[in-house]
Amino acid sequence: GSTVPPMVNVTRSEASEGNITVTCRASGFYPWNITLSWRQDGVSLSHDTQQWGDVLPDGNGTYQTWVATRICQGEEQRFTCYMEHSGNHSTHPVPSGNSHHHHHHHH
């Protein structure tokens, strides 16, 4: 099939006092090969500071996955979700407050 870029969605939730968990979800992409990771100041965090979900079919012939990490509240602007799929890449910031960020990555 043809390449379908992912929809990337970044959310945040309270983890513990002074910390938040930020989750980056990619969905609706094809083929299944994707790089999804959190970066601090433009540098990929080490693997053991991130949690990854499996790349799973979403029932529409496309795939979905996620990556999460815990960060200090107030440092959100230093963290971005980095996505690379089929030779295209994009970065996605942590939303302020409890808002959500949804957008397609365009070629």
């Epitope: 100041d41 433009g42 540098v43 990929s44 965090l45 080490s46 980095y82 890449h89």
Partner: antibody, heavy 119, light 108 residues
Framework: DVHLVESGGGLVQPGGSRKLSCAAS????????MNWVRQAPEKGLEWVAY????????YYADTVKGRFTISRDNPKNTLFLQMTSLRSEDTAMYYC????????????WGQGTLVTVSA | QIVLTQSPAFKSSSLGERVTMTCTAS???????LHWYQQKPGSSPKLWIY???NLASGVPARFSGSGSGTSYSLTISTMEAEDAATYYC?????????FGSGTKVEIK
């Protein structure tokens, strides 16, 4: 003002060890990533190692992996580079650099400390 | 690892001349993770242009940067004596971080 002062350089025999230090001042050290970058005489720049603010993300250049260890003591505002199994090709000026938050990049550099590996 | 190839290695320019140097990556990198540094003999390097096109503090407006994918460039619109230096590009798209081999700019 941001100041980065390296120390610990000198003459070392091949196969020997050396520990470099970088004393940081003028900024909140424990919130910044730090790096070591080196430059052999009359040569270009070579990145050596990166450590993030919490010491939980560390990367090395392939040329030093397994021989060099980057670490930091946040309460003492000090960055370290432990170098072992030194080779002649490790001869260089070693710079301590501060990583720019958000955008990345080496935003501040020390004056460097010279390490010479020779018999 | 991502190899950055800079050209030319050496550039001799007249005062007032337009100078362009390029940095070519061995694989595509994000423009967010490409920076330029200036170094003069006997001195430590300085961050000169960050995230491809943003001038660092104190850098004259005659400097500009651009590019995307595998091709990046630094331009001096009108060469001045104080611009004589070596310029290095650098990427942190992927570890290990790498530098280009540098472009040395001299006054003709």
């Amino acid at each position: 003002d941001v100041h980065l002062v390296e120390s610990g350089g000198g003459l070392v025999q091949p196969g020997g060890s050396r520990k470099l230090s970088c004393a940081a001042s003028g900024f909140t050290f424990n919130t910044f990533g730090m790096n070591w970058v080196r430059q052999a005489p009359e040569k270009g720049l070579e990145w050596v190692a990166y450590i993030n603010s919490g010491s939980n993300t560390i990367y090395y250049a392939d040329t030093v992996k397994g021989r060099f260890t980057i670490s930091r003591d946040n309460p003492k505002n000090t960055l370290f580079l432990q170098m072992t199994s030194l080779r002649s090709e490790d001869t260089a000026m070693y710079y301590c650099t501060r990583w720019e938050p958000v955008t990345g990049g080496f935003s501040y550099w020390g004056q460097g400390t010279l390490v010479t590996v020779s018999a | 690892q991502i190899v950055l190839t800079q050209s030319p290695a050496f550039k001799s320019s007249s005062l007032g001349e337009r100078v362009t140097m390029t940095c070519t990556a061995s694989s595509s990198i994000s423009s967010s993770y490409l920076h330029w540094y200036q170094q003069k003999p006997g001195s430590s390097p300085k961050l000169w242009i960050y995230t491809t096109s943003n001038l660092a503090s104190g850098v004259p407006a005659r400097f500009s940067g651009s590019g995307s994918g595998t091709s990046y460039s630094l331009t001096i619109s009108t060469m001045e004596a104080e611009d004589a230096a070596t310029y290095y590009c650098h990427q942190h798209h992927r570890s290990p971080f790498t530098f280009g081999s540098g472009t040395k700019v001299e006054i003709k």
